[in-house]
Interface confidence: medium
């Protein structure tokens, strides 16, 4: 009679994470008597997956039990596969004894697990940056297998080319991670812009995963200031306005100084939003010129988003009769607190 052979017909099996893997094994004889065991890996560190004779293996189901004692099909199904289950599985016949001894092993079946990448997470710089600066964005995705993966960067639908990508680990692993860093040059129009990281993998069936970052969380557009003066109908009164334009984010504090002394401080509240996402705001002072003997230096000082203050000054000549000095470029919003200086 021919000696028993252990046949594992499949050299490799590929299964998506979460599914069941069927590992086939048949023996060609009922002799010698003894149990079958399944192991992952070979050598002394091999891991017992299923022991026909004893043990409790909640994820393992025997595929065939139809003839029980005469059974020669020892295929198993392993449920709820994860990337950690990847490896080579051996069906091993033991000869009955005290203890049972290994008789013959199958050639092994390599189980590879197709793991979906996690949703890409895009993160930007910790601090805001101003236009014309280059900022870095990172994109991370984990848990995918096999190793082959494609990552692309986009800004407002336009593909970026300045990025570096690494897939770890370099060697064989049950699952992999990807890490990519893209460099983006900010412009004043980027408040509404988006940076997108797109990951394509065999497990996604042509439907890539995307992670996004809004540049509104990264950009700071500093304001431009303009101080102007217009006469008002009342004699000896002048209206001085400070137009704060094209700033982002909204967090802004304005202080009026009269000859270097603080006159009023206010916080931008009712602002006007521009199409590009930046804001405009205007504050004014109603100045009673007759209360002053000398010229008055009025300064509009703006602290934007915690940055060092910027200012614009305007010299108010009190010796001359009030007349138009500069033009009023009307902002959409003229609401602010009036303040008379006496």
């Amino acid at each position: 009679e021919e000696e028993l052979q252990v046949i594992q017909p499949d050299k490799s099996v590929s299964v998506a994470a979460g599914e069941s893997a069927i590992l086939h094994c048949t023996v060609t004889s009922l002799i010698p008597v003894g149990p079958i065991q399944w192991f992952r890996g070979a050598g002394p560190a091999r891991e017992l997956i299923y022991n026909q004779k004893e043990g409790h293996f909640p994820r393992v189901t025997t595929v065939s039990e139809s003839t029980k004692r005469e059974n020669m099909d020892f295929s198993i199904s392993i449920s709820n596969i994860t990337p950690a289950d990847a490896g080579t599985y051996y069906c091993v016949k033991f000869r009955k004894g005290s203890p049972d001894t290994e008789f013959k092993s199958g050639a092994g079946t390599e189980l590879s697990v197709r793991g979906k990448p996690s949703a890409p997470v895009v993160s930007g710089p910790a601090a805001r940056a101003t236009p014309q600066h280059t900022v870095s964005f990172t994109c991370e995705s984990h848990g995918f297998s096999p190793r082959d993966i494609t990552l692309k960067w986009f800004k407002n639908g336009n593909e970026l080319s300045d990025f570096q990508t690494n897939v770890d680990p370099v060697g064989e692993s049950v699952s992999y991670s990807i890490h990519s860093t893209a460099k983006v040059v900010l412009t004043r129009e980027d408040v509404h812009s988006q940076v997108i990281c797109e990951v394509a993998h065999v497990t996604l069936q042509g439907d890539p995963l995307r992670g996004t970052a809004n540049l509104s969380e990264t950009i700071r557009v500093p304001p431009t200031l303009e101080v102007t003066q217009q006469p008002v109908r009342a004699e000896n009164q002048v209206n001085v306005t400070c137009q704060v334009r094209k700033f982002y984010p909204q967090r802004l504090q304005l202080t009026w100084l009269e000859n270097g002394n603080v006159s009023r401080t206010e916080t931008a509240s009712t602002v006007t939003e521009n199409k590009d996402g930046t804001y405009n705001w205007m504050s004014w002072l109603l100045v009673n010129v007759s209360a002053h003997r000398d010229d008055v230096k009025l300064t509009c000082q703006v602290e934007h988003d915690g940055q060092p203050a910027v200012s614009k000054s305007h010299d108010l000549k009190v010796s001359a009769h009030p007349k138009e000095q500069g033009s009023n470029t009307a902002a959409e919003n003229t609401g602010s607190n009036e303040r008379n200086i006496y």
Partner: antibody, heavy 120, light 107 residues
């Protein structure tokens, strides 16, 4: 042919101990997992404990955990159930049964049973 | 624990007629469901193992089906010697629970 013969049953007072024995013959005892199952008078079957062929894997029902101990002696082809701190609700016919190979297999041969009565 | 619920609790069937017993599991036991027959004053006897496999020596009028949580034992043509209590039992995971039993009688 396969035979399983239980012994050691009897009347015992609550809180006392009893040791049941199951003598196996007609098969290679060391190849099989063994089980104790009990049946209270007029009631259904209740699994009590299991022991694998090499005694590596032992399981108990919650109702007996900490009080009962299952063991085996493969050299003597015997299965044991040491029952301590017995209660009235332990009154039942106790069957030993064998299980062919792995834990997912059925109990294919049963003994005739031995009666345990716990009463004061 | 996996709770097994048999229905009906008792069943009266005419000789030669079909008898069907159901066993529902509170969670999946895959195919690890077995059926036993216990006649009065006797020990249980294995009829069907792993949901649908007929134990050696058991008449072919007995059959089993199902997987997961719903299982059925069928006696295609009831004989007088089939009067007994029938139990389902799962071996998917300890504790290895039994159903409460179904008593089959002749109508």
């Amino acid at each position: 042919q396969v035979q399983l013969v239980e012994s050691g049953g009897g009347v015992v007072q609550p809180g006392r101990s009893l040791r049941l024995s199951c003598a196996a013959s007609g098969f290679t005892f060391s190849d099989y997992g063994m089980i104790w199952v009990r049946q209270a008078p007029g009631k259904g079957l209740e699994w009590v404990a299991s022991i694998s062929s090499s005694s590596s894997y032992i399981y108990y029902a919650d109702s007996v955990k900490g009080r009962f101990t299952i063991s085996r002696d493969n050299s003597k082809n015997r299965l044991y159930l040491q029952m301590n701190s017995l209660r009235a609700e332990d009154t039942a016919v106790y069957y030993c049964a064998r299980r062919y190979y792995g834990f997912n297999y059925p109990f294919d041969y049963w003994g005739q049973g031995t009666m345990v009565t716990v009463s004061s | 624990d996996t709770v097994l619920t048999q229905s009906p609790d008792s069943l009266a069937v005419s000789l030669g007629q079909r008898a069907t017993i159901n066993c529902g599991a509170s969670k999946s036991v895959r195919t690890y469901m077995h059926w036993y027959q216990q006649k009065p004053g006797q020990q249980p006897k294995l009829l069907i193992y792993s949901a649908s496999n007929l134990e050696a020596g058991v008449p072919s009028r007995f059959s089993g089906s199902g997987s997961g949580t719903d299982f059925t034992l069928t006696i295609s043509s009831l004989q007088a010697e089939d009067v007994a209590v029938y139990y389902c039992q799962q071996s998917n995971e300890p504790p290895y629970t039994f159903g409460q039993g179904t008593k089959v009688e002749i109508k």
